[in-house]
């Protein structure tokens, strides 16, 4: 027989020959991090076909770290459903706590013990600090100085000084989160205030008010002979100007036509008649048609209004 | 607070051009709109446009196009108002007004300057 | 553009009266009327805005109603210094126009 087997749990006791005779045997020992768990042999021979007799390294077990118990308010995970060495052990905290310590620990061999590479970590409660104070306003508990998971404030605008009250820009509600740190930025207070909205040969047909503050909502229809060029609908947004701009209402202008030819007894010809406003400098807006009363709005004769007041 | 001090009267002939001002003060310039309104001895007010010192921008009333230019001179916190190929259809008071953030209504006027188109 | 009609030119009342003065227009304006008053001297002053928002300043006998096409500006009770002309002006869509005035006297 050529060189017996090699095998990844256990090796062969003494040198390996180039050959070995028929009926010859060889005896294997677990490696170093292995154990022999009886009743599997470890040896095998060299049989009358010049092959080995099948053996397996399956009587030697890798040595296993030491069992951990899941964290409290979390679980401990091997990455292969094992503790043996060379394999994982991943950490996962339960929903409203957070890790402190290796999220991962090793199972490795020292000498010929398995150990593992760390210490376990801990799940520790998520707790925030106060949410930041904003200029121009202020949030609910107020007064509490350690926020719990999930815990939520809502942020509101103080009354302003002058005519036009602050806007809270943002989202007013965040909540303590994973990492102890808040679900989002604080929303900010300020005075968003768009310019009144003018439309030549055109008119606002809804959104109505005094005045126009952060996400006010204006729509514009164009008179008769006119086209929008733009949106219909525009909203007020944070920095105080319209989106999208404010439209404009352009002249409806019919298209060049070309006249038939004139018929005569003799000659006939042909003459193009320009527009007279083609003539006009700059580019000329292709046609569009008027934009008439948007159904399903109310007219502004109707006296309904919509007062952003 | 707000003030709006306009130029003296103007006495020109027919078919001249005049240069009305308005010099605001109380407020910072560019923050306000400037109107201007015309009103014929014994009659009403018409609005002739508005300019926005800020960026420049303008409105005119379709009426006045051609007749009126709006300018301004932040420099000097000043609006100014020219009158083109004057007739006597053009004697008038002519005032200036501040709107804030282009809402028209006007809650601050100057005392008006006169303008007589004689030959 | 949009008419803007005082029909009443001139108006006689006695102080302390209550005086109301009616202007109308040619389409309807959403509220987007304001109010002025011109004193005989030619000044020009803000009364109300937005139909019925009183400007800073004004005293609070001057209030203003209205909606549609027809709006109107009361004073509750007639002072001296109220002897003036009062205009209405629209301003939801230009040109801006304003009614041609309603002269107020003392009786």
């Known amino acids: 027989c050529e060189e017996p087997p090699t095998f990844e749990a256990m090796e062969l006791i003494g040198k390996p020959k180039p050959y070995y005779e028929i009926g010859e045997r060889v005896d294997y020992k677990c490696k170093k991090g292995y154990f022999y768990i009886p009743p599997l042999a470890t040896h095998t021979i060299c049989d009358r076909n010049h092959t080995w007799l099948p053996v397996s390294d399956d009587a030697c077990y890798r040595e296993t770290c030491p069992y951990i118990r899941d964290p409290l308010n979390g679980q401990a995970v091997p990455a292969n459903g094992t503790y043996e060495f060379g394999y994982q052990m991943h950490f996962i905290c339960n929903e409203g706590y957070y890790l402190i310590g290796e999220e991962i620990l090793y199972c490795e061999l020292k000498g010929s013990v398995a150990i593992w590479s760390g210490k376990p970590p801990i799940c520790e409660k998520v707790l925030c600090t106060p949410p930041p104070k904003i200029k121009n306003g202020k949030h609910t508990f107020s007064e509490v100085e350690v926020f719990e998971y999930l815990d939520a404030v809502t942020y509101s605008c103080d009354p302003a000084p002058g005519p036009d009250p602050f806007s809270l820009i943002g989202e007013s509600t965040i909540y303590c989160g994973d990492n102890s740190v808040w679900s989002r930025a604080a929303p900010e207070c300020k005075v968003v205030k768009c310019r009144f909205p003018v439309v030549e040969n055109g008119k606002q047909i809804s959104g109505f008010g005094k005045k126009f503050y952060y996400k006010a909502t204006v729509m514009f229809e164009c008179d008769k002979g006119f086209y929008l060029d733009g949106s219909d609908t525009i909203v007020c947004d944070s920095n105080s100007t319209w989106d999208p701009p404010v439209p404009k209402c352009l002249k409806v202008l019919p298209p060049s036509s070309t006249k038939p030819p004139a018929l005569s007894h003799s000659v006939s010809t042909s003459s193009t008649t320009k527009s007279p406003a083609s003539s006009a400098s700059g580019p000329r807006p292709t046609y569009k048609p008027p934009v008439s009363n948007y159904p399903g709005y109310p007219k502004p004769e109707e006296g309904i209004l919509d007062s952003l007041d | 607070q707000v003030q709006l001090q306009q130029s003296g009267p103007e006495l020109v002939k027919p078919g001249a051009s005049v240069k009305l001002s308005c010099k605001a003060s109380?407020?910072?310039?560019?923050?306000?709109?400037i109107n201007w309104v015309k009103q014929r001895p014994g009659q009403g007010l018409e609005w002739i446009g508005w300019?926005?010192?800020?960026?420049?921008?303008?409105k005119y009333n379709e009426k006045f196009k051609g007749k009126a230019t709006l300018t301004v001179d932040t420099s000097s916190s000043t609006a100014y108002m020219d009158l083109h190929s004057l007739t006597s259809e053009d004697s008038a008071v002519f005032f200036c007004?501040?709107?804030?953030?282009?809402?028209?209504?006007?809650?601050?006027w100057g005392q008006g300057t006169l303008v007589t188109v004689s030959a | 553009g949009i008419q803007m009609t005082q029909t009443t030119s001139s108006l006689s009342a006695s102080l302390g009266d209550r005086v109301t003065i009616s202007c109308s227009a040619s389409?309807?304006?959403?509220?987007?009327l304001n109010w002025y008053q011109q004193k005989p001297d030619g000044t020009v002053k803000l009364l109300i805005y937005?139909?019925?928002s009183l400007h800073s300043g004004v005293p609070s006998r001057f209030s203003g109603s209205g909606s549609g096409t027809d709006y109107s500006l009361t004073i509750s009770n007639l002072e001296p210094e109220d002897i003036a002309t009062y205009y209405c002006?629209?301003?939801?869509?230009?040109?801006?126009?304003f009614g041609s005035g309603t002269k107020l006297e003392i009786k």
């Open positions: 007004a501040v709107s804030e953030d282009g809402y028209p209504w006007f809650p601050y």
């Open positions: 109380g407020y910072t310039f560019t923050n306000y709109d």
């Open positions: 300019i926005y010192p800020r960026d420049g921008s303008f």
């Open positions: 389409q309807g304006i959403s509220n987007y």
């Open positions: 937005y139909t019925s």
């Open positions: 002006q629209q301003y939801i869509k230009l040109p801006f126009t």
